[in-house]
C-alpha cells in the first residue's frame, strides 16, 4: 500500500509504480506537450491584467487557447481509452492471478487514476474559464471599438455639415464683399471728383488769402497810424478834462469833491449822473487799483458794465491765463474786462448777466441770467449762473452747473482734449460745451460750418459763427 512511487521516465511520461507483496504494478500516463509542466504550477485564481491586450494579440492567444483545449480534449479521450484498456487487461490478470485480498490494491490504484483524471479535468475547467473570460473581454473590446467607430462617424458627419454651412456662409460673405467693393469703387470715384473740386477751391482760396494778407499788412500799417492818432487824441482829451476839472473846482468846491469819488461799476457811475455811453474808470472793491471799462447807459435802463465785446475780429482772443485775468483789448471796441475784477465785483453783491448776440442776417437775441458770479482764481474763475430768460434759447448755452475757466495755457475743462486750444479762446468749457463767445472771428459768408467760431448753440447751432456779442453785468437791485 505504502510503497507507492511517482517518477519520470526518459521519454517524459508520468510513471506510477505500486509495490504490493511480491507483485509490482506500473502505470505509464502520457504527458501532453502543450500542458503546463508540474514545475510551474497553474494558479487558477490569478488576477487578470487590467490593461487591454492589443486586438491582434488577443485573437492570436485565443487561437492558441483553442488549440490547447483541442489537444486536452484529445488527450482526455486517449486517457479514457488507455484507462479502459489497462483496466480490462488488469481485470483479466487479476481474475487470472490475483487472490481475494488483491482487490483492495486495485481499488486504490483505480482511486489514484480517478484522482489524476479529476485533477486533469479541474485544470481543463480552469483553462476553459480563462478562455471564456478572455473571449468575453475581447467581445467587450470589440463592442467598445464599434461604439467608438459609430461616435467618430457621427462626429465626421456633424463636421461635414458644419463645413457645408461655413462654405455657404463664406460664399454669401464673398458676394457681400464683392458688392461692397463695387460700392466702394463708386464712392472712391465720387470722393476723387470732390477732391478735385476741393483742390480747385483751395487754390482759389489761396489766392484770396494772399490778397487778404496783403490787405491785412496795409490795414495793420493804417491801424498803427490810427492808434497813434487815437493815443494823441486821448491825451488831448485828458488834458482838456484836467483843465476843465481844475477850472470847475476853482468855481465850485462841491463838484471837485464829487469828481474824486471812485466807482465800483457802471451802475454807480450811472447813479452819479453820468448817463452817457462811454469808457469810465472803475476801482477794484476794497482797493485803489483801477480798471477802464465801457459803460452802456442806454440799453435796458442803463448802468451795464461791459465785460466782453466782439464785433469785427480786430482783437485776438487766443490769449493766456494772465491776459484773461487782467483783461485785454480796447474798451471802445473788442475787449475782455478781466476775470479778477469781475470775480471780486460779483462776490460783493448779487449781479445779473445779460448776453446780447447778433447774427449775419440782421437778427438779434439775448440771454439773461438773474444771478451771476465768478469764483476766485484759486477756483479757476468758475462761473455760477441761475434763472435763464431771453430769446437766445430756452436752455443755457453756458453749461450748467458752471465750469472752470480754461485758456490755451490753463486747461481746466472736462474733455481729454484741450478745448481752448482746439476751439480757440478762453471760456468756461465743458467737454467742450455748447458755447464759446471768445472763439475765432469769421467774416460773413465764411461763418458757417465752423467748429471754432463764436458759438451760441441754442440760438444758432454748433457751426454758426456770430457777427457780434456783448456780455454785460449790473447789480440785481439796480
Amino acid at each position: 500500500y505504502n510503497n507507492f512511487r511517482k517518477s519520470m521516465d526518459s521519454i517524459g511520461k508520468k510513471q506510477y509504480q505500486v509495490q504490493h507483496g511480491s507483485c509490482s504494478y506500473t502505470f505509464l500516463l502520457p504527458e501532453m506537450d502543450n500542458c503546463r509542466s508540474s514545475s510551474s504550477p497553474y494558479v487558477s485564481n490569478a488576477v487578470q491584467r487590467d490593461a487591454p491586450l492589443e486586438y491582434d494579440d488577443s485573437v492570436q492567444r485565443l487561437q492558441v487557447l483553442e488549440n490547447i483545449m483541442e489537444n486536452n480534449t484529445q488527450w482526455l479521450m486517449k486517457l479514457e481509452n488507455y484507462i479502459q484498456d489497462n483496466m480490462k487487461k488488469e481485470m483479466v490478470e487479476i481474475q487470472q492471478n490475483a487472490v481475494q485480498n488483491q482487490t483492495a490494491v486495485m481499488i486504490e490504484i483505480g482511486t489514484n487514476l480517478l484522482n489524476q483524471t479529476a485533477e486533469q479535468t479541474r485544470k481543463l475547467t480552469d483553462v476553459e474559464a480563462q478562455v471564456l473570460n478572455q473571449t468575453t473581454r475581447l467581445e467587450l473590446q470589440l463592442l467598445e471599438h464599434s461604439l467608438s467607430t459609430n461616435k467618430l462617424e457621427k462626429q465626421i458627419l456633424d463636421q461635414t455639415s458644419e463645413i457645408n454651412k461655413l462654405q455657404d456662409k463664406n460664399s454669401f460673405l464673398e458676394k457681400k464683399v464683392l458688392a461692397m467693393e463695387d460700392k466702394h469703387i463708386i464712392q472712391l470715384q465720387s470722393i476723387k471728383e470732390e477732391k478735385d473740386q476741393l483742390q480747385v477751391l483751395v487754390s482759389k482760396q489761396n489766392s484770396i488769402i494772399e490778397e487778404l494778407e496783403k490787405k491785412i499788412v496795409t490795414a495793420t500799417v493804417n491801424n498803427s497810424v490810427l492808434q497813434k492818432q487815437q493815443h494823441d487824441l486821448m491825451e488831448t482829451v485828458n488834458n482838456l478834462l484836467t483843465m476843465m476839472s481844475t477850472s470847475n473846482s476853482a468855481k465850485d468846491p462841491t463838484v471837485a469833491k464829487e469828481e474824486q469819488i471812485s466807482f465800483r461799476d457802471c451802475a454807480e457811475v450811472f447813479k452819479s449822473g453820468h448817463t452817457t455811453n462811454g469808457i469810465y474808470t472803475l476801482t477794484f472793491p476794497n482797493s485803489t487799483e483801477e480798471i477802464k471799462a465801457y459803460c452802456d447807459m442806454e440799453a435796458g435802463g442803463g448802468g451795464w458794465t461791459i465785460i466782453q465785446r466782439r464785433e469785427d475780429g480786430s482783437v485776438d482772443f487766443q490769449r493766456t491765463w494772465k491776459e484773461y485775468k487782467v483783461g485785454f483789448g480796447n474798451p471802445s471796441g473788442e475787449y475782455w474786462l478781466g476775470n479778477e475784477f469781475v470775480s471780486q465785483l460779483t462776490n460783493q453783491q448779487r449781479y445779473v448777466l445779460k448776453i446780447h448776440l447778433k447774427d449775419w442776417e440782421g437778427n438779434e437775441a439775448y440771454s439773461l441770467y438773474e444771478h451771476f458770479y465768478l469764483s476766485s482764481e484759486e477756483l479757476n474763475y468758475r462761473i455760477h449762473l441761475k434763472g435763464l430768460t431771453g430769446t437766445a434759447g430756452k436752455i443755457s448755452s453756458i453749461s450748467q452747473p458752471g465750469n472752470d475757466f480754461s485758456t490755451k495755457d490753463g486747461d481746466n475743462d472736462k474733455c481729454i482734449c484741450k478745448c481752448s486750444q482746439m476751439l480757440t479762446g478762453g471760456w468756461w468749457f465743458d467737454a467742450c460745451g455748447p458755447s464759446n463767445l471768445n472763439g475765432m472771428y469769421y467774416p460773413q459768408r465764411q461763418n458757417t460750418n465752423k467748429f471754432n467760431g463764436i458759438k451760441w448753440y441754442y440760438w444758432k447751432g454748433s457751426g454758426y459763427s456770430l457777427k457780434a456779442t456783448t456780455m454785460m453785468i449790473r447789480p440785481a437791485d439796480f
Epitope: G393, G433, N449, F451, Y457, S462
Partner: nanobody, 120 residues
Framework: QVQLVESGGGLVQPGGSLRLSCAAS????????MHWVRQAPGKGLVWVSR????????SYADSVKGRFTISRDNAKNTLYLQMNSLRAEDTAVYYC?????????????WGQGTLVTVSS
C-alpha cells in the same frame, strides 16, 4: 449709448403723404438740434431740414419748402418729418441726425435710415 431709429417710410403714390418718425434714446433729446438728411439712389447726401432744441426755430432746403414740415416732441424724445405733395424725386433713404455741440454744424450721430419710394 446714443441711438436714433427712423420709421414710417414706404411706398407712396405721387401727390401722396407720409410722416417719418425718429425715436431718440441714450441722451437728453431736448438739449440738441436735430436734422433730416436724405440720399437718393446712387446720389450723395442732401440736407432736408433742421429744428432747434425747443422747436421754436426751423429751416428747410428750397426743394422741400412748403411741402415738408419738421417738428419734435421732447416729452416723447421723437423727431418728425411730415411730407406732403410727394414727388418721384423725393424717393430716397431718409436719415435723422443729431447736431453736436462742437461739431461745427456737422452731425455726430445718425440713424440707420428709412426708405421712401414715390412711384405710381
Amino acid at each position: 449709448q446714443v441711438q436714433l431709429v427712423e420709421s414710417g417710410g414706404g411706398l407712396v403714390q405721387p401727390g401722396g403723404s407720409l410722416r417719418l418718425s425718429c425715436a431718440a434714446s441714450g441722451y437728453t433729446f431736448a438739449a440738441y438740434w436735430m436734422h433730416w438728411v436724405r440720399q437718393a439712389p446712387g446720389k450723395g447726401l442732401v440736407w432736408v431740414s433742421r429744428i432747434n432744441s425747443d422747436g421754436s426755430s426751423t429751416s428747410y432746403a428750397d426743394s422741400v419748402k412748403g411741402r415738408f414740415t419738421i417738428s419734435r416732441d421732447n416729452a416723447k424724445n421723437t423727431l418728425y418729418l411730415q411730407m406732403n405733395s410727394l414727388r418721384a424725386e423725393d424717393t430716397a433713404v431718409y436719415y435723422c441726425a443729431r447736431e453736436g455741440y462742437s461739431s461745427g454744424g456737422q452731425f455726430d450721430y445718425w440713424g440707420q435710415g428709412t426708405l421712401v419710394t414715390v412711384s405710381s
